[in-house]
């Protein structure tokens, strides 16, 4: 048996930020579960990582370098992504394992969500007035 | 080829303590969680600790928890558990596995043996 997730099908990250929420088919409650976010279409980077039971505070890593935290729904986790390069943009996968008590238990793959990182533009310098006609 | 490997096993007197490891090689160990599980003597297989992949996270089963500590060390690829105030009823084979739906991967196992 497989937990389902649902995630939004694209986000733009218009101030290099993003909240990405992950929706999931399981109540977490009373549960030690590990939700983690991973980066490009093979997963291959782990951007996130949210441990979290209901009897202590959640415990948020990225050993990728990313900037992140999290927050905790019943059935949610929300990623919350700070200072975000354009580079970064790609297609990003949430994932759920139920860690305690057995028997592990994780999601089927999401379809995931395309993350549009937009650069900061700086405000262009007002033109200068021509001159002035007597 | 996936590999496990245990190693540490042997006979301890009740209260005494044993660190085991698990050698792992033919996959990349970094990327997965890991767990010990046991079998006693006439018994069905006990779960007994995982960590999961960055080494972040530990649980326990109740019977070994405050007694037993797992570990990892992901640039030699080896999982590690700590045993101490050992009793009789820890007298198991001792595995190490992938810890997953699957357990895809699963050492050999290592006798442990607690008696006085």
């Known amino acids: 048996n497989k937990i389902l997730v649902k995630q939004s099908p694209m986000l733009v990250a218009y101030d290099n930020a993003v909240n990405l929420s992950c929706k999931y088919s399981y109540n977490l409650f009373s549960r030690e579960f590990r939700a983690s976010l991973h980066k490009g279409l093979d997963s291959a980077v782990e951007v996130c990582v949210v441990y979290g039971n209901y009897s202590q505070q959640l415990q948020v890593y990225s050993k990728t370098g990313f900037n992140c935290d999290g927050k905790l729904g019943n059935e949610s986790v929300t990623f919350y992504l700070q200072n975000l390069y354009v580079n970064q943009t790609d297609i990003y996968f949430c994932k759920i394992e139920v860690m305690y008590p057995p028997p592990y238990l994780d999601n089927e793959k999401s379809n995931g969500t395309i993350i549009h990182v937009k650069g900061k533009h700086l405000c262009p310098s007002p033109l200068f007035p021509g001159p002035s006609k007597p | 080829e996936v590999q496990l490997l245990e190693s540490g096993g042997g006979w301890v007197q009740p209260g005494g303590s044993l660190r085991l490891s698990c050698a792992a090689s033919g996959f990349t160990f970094s990327r997965y969680h890991m767990a010990w599980v046991r079998q006693a003597p006439g018994k069905g297989l006990e779960w007994v600790s995982v960590i999961d992949s960055l080494g972040l996270q530990a649980y326990y089963a109740d019977s070994v928890k405050g007694r037993f500590t797992i570990s990892r060390d992901n640039s030699k690829n080896t999982l590690y558990l700590q045993m101490n105030s050992m009793r009789a009823e820890d007298t198991a084979v001792y595995y190490c596995?992938?810890?997953?739906?699957?357990?895809?991967?699963w050492g050999q196992g290592t006798l442990v043996t607690v008696s006085s």
């Open positions: 596995a992938e810890y997953s739906g699957a357990f895809d991967y």
